[in-house]
Amino acid sequence: AGVFELQIHSFGPGPGPGAPRSPCSARLPCRLFFRVCLKPGLSEEAAESPCALGAALSARGPVYTEQPGAPAPDLPLPDGLLQVPFRDAWPGTFSFIIETWREELGDQIGGPAWSLLARVAGRRRLAAGGPWARDIQRAGAWELRFSYRARCEPPAVGTACTRLCRPRSAPSRCGPGLRPCAPLEDECEAPLVCRAGCSPEHGFCEQPGECRCLEGWTGPLCTVPVSTSSCLSPRGPSSATTGCLVPGPGPCDGNPCANGGSCSETPRSFECTCPRGFYGLRCEVSGVTCADGPCFNGGLCVGGADPDSAYICHCPPGFQGSNCEKRVDRCSLQPCRNGGLCLDLGHALRCRCRAGFAGPRCEHDLDDCAGRACANGGTCVEGGGAHRCSCALGFGGRDCRERADPCAARPCAHGGRCYAHFSGLVCACAPGYMGARCEFPVHPDGASALPAAPPGLRPGDPQRYL
């Protein structure tokens, strides 16, 4: 057993041109936090495969507000280390994923909003007990500097944390083949990690994970004394007749501890040592709440206001799992029509359409658009044998190559007034309308008091002119 420790030194713009925009602004102050995921071995595993060695979340960093006009500096970081405890041997070779998350603190609906800023990954060799290893990783225009190490938790020692240190049985020397434990010279190395909870005084092991008892002791963890009087049968009679204790099933048999807890026998019953994030008699209660930010990939955390109530992660499209940690293969749903090629880009789904088709899902048959391109994100629309471009906001002309007044396309619905702005446009809505483009009437026309039948489909409306 031991702990993998990660220290983040800095997160900020990398060298070279194209410095990233600050992730925070005066309107949307934010703070960073980090997630680390560890997997054993050097295999190229998918990002969504389980963090078999463990995972950890950092605390939230200090709130940061961008200074207008200033370049994005290194961003303020959370205090402390990220610690990932591991129960078994340290594998020596491991893969890691470190994610930098942004928590927006603006006037968010339903609490803060989380978004993934950067993800770095790598494969490394590392011996437990060694010095801190330094690393620099780049993700797009961002650069992450960090150090890491693996250390064993006493009594484990060694490069894989598989050997144990035990107090010396004799004052002068260790047993045959066993060395003193540096730096604890008064202790000796034991060659193997025995079964968790195996009595250090009365048990030993010749294979990892086993617990063999010295003479006079019994039980799965060698904690039960055996009477010296002879037993009459291989299983022994009841203790009432001869005082010979029958080793019955131990309280830790079958490991009653849930969620990776380790079981230790006690004089009366058993005791579970729970991993971080769980508690309760059998480690059955999750101590994680929504405040810990357990939902990844922008998932919405609901419930879990206190440690005794469960939380649920509502995952955004493209992610699933109890913590939104698994990416869904959205292309398996075959969303691209007309033979389009599906590309799952992670942040979005794209369809690469065959010639003659267009649209987000290749749903538009554009025979007369074949071979014709609309520039600047415009979409080609079929129209009686002639190709026409429906241009993205801010562009116009036959092929969308001309920069247009963003307000010329009348982008504000329902009589909203359009104002050109350096970042695009702003709509000032007429009374009774809401939305970025005034497209939502607060009380739609004709919605009089009930009894009013549902209006059903209305292909047009009185404001068709805008």
């Epitope: 609906i109 649209g359 987000p360 899902r361 749903e363 429906s390 619905a413 939305g435 970025a436 483009r437 497209e439 939502f440 739609p444 489909l457 209305r458 292909p459 047009g460 409306d461 404001q463 068709r464 002119y465 805008l466």
Partner: nanobody, 117 residues
Framework: EVQLVESGGGLVQPGGSLTLSCAAS????????SAWYRQAPGKKRELVAG???????VYIDSVKGRFTISRDNAKNSVYLQMNSLRAEDTAVYYC???????????WGQGTLVTVSS
């Protein structure tokens, strides 16, 4: 022509949750501004939540922090996740779409949500 079909309504206890779904035919929801409206007995239909083509959202004050509107372009659907429901949320909920291509409004037929113990 855009057709909208709502589902997910029903009877739920106060404090409970429901998710309403609205499936759009033909046109992709990424080209539509979509919203959920509701009409309680004896009251005017009112906007509950809306999501614009750029993903920005609006909510009325009485549902902020409890309701979340979202859309899945791949499934051509819009959703309303309703948590901590109250008796005053009882209404017929309508899906709405505003087409920027035709500058037209479209409505679904409505789905009834009843919050009662």
């Amino acid at each position: 022509e855009v057709q909208l079909v709502e589902s997910g309504g029903g009877l739920v206890q106060p404090g409970g949750s429901l998710t309403l779904s609205c499936a759009a035919s033909e046109s992709s929801v990424s080209f539509l501004s979509s919203a959920w409206y509701r009409q309680a007995p004896g009251k005017k239909r009112e906007l509950v939540a809306g999501i614009s083509t750029d993903g920005s959202t609006v909510y009325i004050d009485s549902v902020k922090g409890r309701f979340t509107i979202s859309r899945d372009n791949a499934k051509n659907s819009v959703y309303l996740q309703m948590n901590s429901l109250r008796a005053e949320d009882t209404a017929v909920y309508y899906c709405y779409a505003y087409s920027w291509t035709t500058r037209s409004r479209y409505w679904g037929q409505g789905t009834l949500v009843t919050v009662s113990s």
